[in-house]
């Protein structure tokens, strides 16, 4: 499928609007500090060049790879060295090393100002004045803050963003119409970004085989009526799509994702009965819908797994002939029967099965050796079940905010070296598992909870990788992708940690806390809680609860006072003294 000009091929396939949007996303994900106007200029130059190649594929430079064309364009930025430091050294390299170098410099936590939402009237005016620039700015701001955001999915978010403004800027009460929609897009966007970040981490840190195993398990749960060969084809295609997007090849990724959606819809009879509605939608909605589609019903009377994978005399023969295919079939068969299991649990079972075969197929009596392999699965299944049961009970007892606080204390004691903002962000997200998953019936709890926790713990892993401070975090993050959650769960209080020096400034608060939103106020309190645990890691739950209750009362009192700032200064000193006494600081 060779084309004389790759850039012309992608421009024609995607159309000018999507082409420009995807190039903007790609550039913003690479050069995260560059001003919007500079990126727009570069994108316009690339687009004009692409048009010359569409007109004449033999024109100068049209035969160059997209990495070469895009890399050359990025390397013309006049302040590359000053703004990006050593990333400028990437420009001295040739492809493909140059692109690899750019990828390595993507920053999961870029030093960018928080996005502040302007007044609704201001946003609506900007939207009406220049809709195109307004939407480009949305793509740019999201892409630079989320350098691994799934690009074709970001186009879908932008479409919804545009629809929200189109509808709500004409509404009688613009704010009532628009703000809930923007909140929903923000929350969904953060979740989408985190899910994609895990896919990219899986591919980049653990390799294609790990990603394919994940995809076999997930697609087998989703499409249990599909044949193994069909699932394998979908896995291969999906792996290509995500490899491209994670590698910065956004045009190819979007093009291949569209092809995959087309294939799925053309073959839905042999894939799933749940796809009909998705396949009637336009392209971006269709792809999103397929990615989120509910699990199809399991085929009736599936035979016992034991027959093919334990009782058969050909187990070792089949395994030896094609190890990965046989393990893939095992994973497919197990997953399609168990929509009630998390993907990571299914992968742990497959790993246990593989380890057993590796050992037993070399033994004197292989069958005798692996005959009880399914018994080894029981504790692996029970561990997440029990954990989820306990934590859902705790969540129901405490509510989300206090459940988050319990996790904050738990994780700060496990890995106190991790930065406070990271501990707050990760623990808050871990705590959201309660409202997200505990409402589900038993059969849906584990896939919801444990697979969500994998996404959140990956956030911890990528943030920690940027500035590693804890060997325990590094160990849990790097040893095994599927055992990350059990690894963190198993961590006890870090006895080697030297408590942080007490700093009164950390616990000094001002009247500005009174004007914060409830969420921001919670974050302030949770930040103080983490700092408290870092100062006194041996503090009991009761001690910490008493201090936090006093703190909440202090904030409430001073926010009602006439002279708030004086109240915060005077009462704050008393609170710090009382807290020190209560905790023995």
């Amino acid at each position: 499928d060779a084309h004389k000009s790759e850039v012309a091929h992608r421009f024609k396939d995607l159309g000018e609007e999507n082409f420009k949007a995807l190039v903007l996303i790609a550039f913003a994900q690479y050069l995260q500090q560059c001003p919007f106007e500079d990126h727009v200029k570069l994108v316009n130059e690339v687009t004009e060049f692409a048009k010359t190649c569409v007109a004449d594929e033999s024109a100068e430079n049209c035969d160059k790879s997209l990495h070469t064309l895009f890399g050359d364009k990025l390397c013309t930025v006049a302040t590359l060295r000053e703004t990006y430091g050593e990333m400028a050294d990437c420009c001295a390299k040739q492809e493909p090393e140059r692109n690899e170098c750019f990828l390595q410099h993507k920053d999961d936590n870029p030093n960018l100002p928080r996005l502040v939402r302007p007044e609704v009237d201001v946003m609506c005016t900007a939207f009406h004045d220049n809709e195109e620039t307004f939407l480009k700015k949305y793509l740019y701001e999201i892409a630079r803050r989320h350098p691994y955001f799934y690009a074709p999915e970001l186009l879908f978010f932008a479409k919804r963003y545009k629809a929200a403004f189109t509808e709500c800027c004409q509404a009688a009460d613009k704010a009532a119409c628009l703000l809930p929609k923007l909140d929903e897009l923000r929350d969904e966007g953060k979740a989408s970004s985190a899910k994609q970040r895990l896919k990219c981490a899986s591919l980049q840190k653990f390799g294609e085989r790990a990603f394919k195993a994940w995809a076999v398990a997930r697609l087998s749960q989703r499409f249990p009526k599909a044949e193994f060969a069909e699932v394998s084809k979908l896995v291969t295609d999906l792996t290509k799509v995500h490899t491209e997007c994670c590698h910065g090849d956004l045009l190819e990724c979007a093009d291949d994702r569209a092809d995959l959606a087309k294939y799925i819809c053309e073959n839905q009879d042999s894939i799933s009965s749940k796809l009909k509605e998705c396949c009637e939608k336009p392209l971006l909605e269709k792809s999103h819908c397929i990615a989120e589609v509910e699990n199809d019903e399991m085929p009736a009377d599936l035979p016992s797994l034991a027959a093919d994978f334990v009782e058969s005399k050909d187990v070792c023969k089949n395994y030896a002939e094609a190890k990965d295919v046989f393990l893939g079939m095992f994973l497919y068969e197990y997953a399609r029967r168990h929509p009630d299991y998390s993907v990571v649990l299914l992968l742990r079972l497959a790993k246990t099965y593989e380890t057993t075969l590796e050992k037993c197929c070399a033994a004197a009596d292989p069958h005798e050796c692996y005959a009880k392999v399914f018994d080894e699965f029981k504790p692996l299944v029970e561990e997440p079940q029990n954990l989820i049961k306990q934590n859902c009970e705790l969540f129901e007892q405490l509510g989300e905010y206090k459940f988050q606080n319990a996790l904050l204390v738990r994780y700060t004691k496990k890995v106190p070296q991790v930065s406070t903002p990271t501990l707050v962000e990760v623990s808050r997200n871990l705590g959201k598992v309660g409202s997200k998953c505990c409402k589900h019936p038993e059969a849906k709890r584990m896939p919801c909870a444990e697979d969500y926790l994998s996404v959140v713990l990956n956030q911890l892993c990528v943030l920690h990788e940027k500035t590693p401070v804890s060997d325990r975090v590094t160990k849990c993050c790097t040893e095994s992708l599927v055992n990350r959650r059990p690894c963190f769960s198993a961590l006890e209080v870090d006895e080697t940690y030297v408590p942080k020096e007490f700093n009164a400034e950390t616990f000094t608060f001002h009247a500005d806390i009174c004007t914060l939103s409830e969420k921001e106020r919670q974050i302030k309190k949770q930040t103080a809680l983490v700092e408290l645990v870092k100062h006194k890691p041996k503090a009991t739950k009761e001690q910490l609860k008493a201090v936090m209750d006093d703190f909440a009362a202090f904030v409430e009192k001073c926010c009602k006072a006439d002279d708030k700032e004086t109240c915060f200064a005077e009462e704050g000193k008393k609170l710090v003294a009382a807290s020190q006494a209560a905790l023995g600081l």
Epitope: E45, D72, K73, C75, T76, V77, A78, T79, L80, R81, A88, C91, A92
Partner: nanobody
Framework: EVQLVESGGGLVQPGGSLHLSCAAS????????????MAWFRQAPGAERELLAN????????NYRDSVKGRAAIFRDNAKNTLYLNINSLKAEDTAVYYC?????????????????WGQGTQVTVSS
């Protein structure tokens, strides 16, 4: 190989304009001026040499440092083997030695280390 010679420097009044040229000669046989990405740099006393503007081989694409964006123009005439830089609304901070540079990377890199050939520089002083 290419030899670069800048001209057009001197004393200029604040608010005035600057017109610099850079003539390329002694090009290797079979190599043309359009085989090079070009740039203008400047170096003020006690400061590092900084990229002001860069241009690709054909002259189609240009980039500027923020401090001169909107008041500078880089362009080239490949038939005359010459690079130009115009800056207007000059300020005292524009006082520096201005250098022309050539790169074998035809796209005109934004990084000093990727320019292999340099002129001797021309002094520009902005003062009343």
């Amino acid at each position: 190989e290419v030899q670069l010679v800048e001209s057009g420097g001197g004393l200029v009044q604040p608010g005035g304009s600057l017109h610099l040229s850079c003539a390329a000669s002694r090009l290797t046989t079979g190599v043309t001026f359009s085989d090079y990405g070009m740039a203008w740099f400047r170096q003020a006393p006690g400061a590092e040499r900084e990229l002001l503007a860069n241009i690709n081989w054909s002259g189609q694409y240009t980039n500027y440092r923020d401090s001169v964006k909107g008041r500078a123009a880089i362009f080239r005439d490949n038939a005359k083997n010459t690079l130009y830089l115009n800056i207007n609304s000059l300020k005292a901070e524009d006082t520096a030695v201005y250098y022309c540079a050539a790169s074998s990377r035809k796209y005109g890199p934004g990084i000093k280390s990727q320019y292999e050939w340099w002129g001797q520089g021309t002094q520009v002083t902005v003062s009343s």
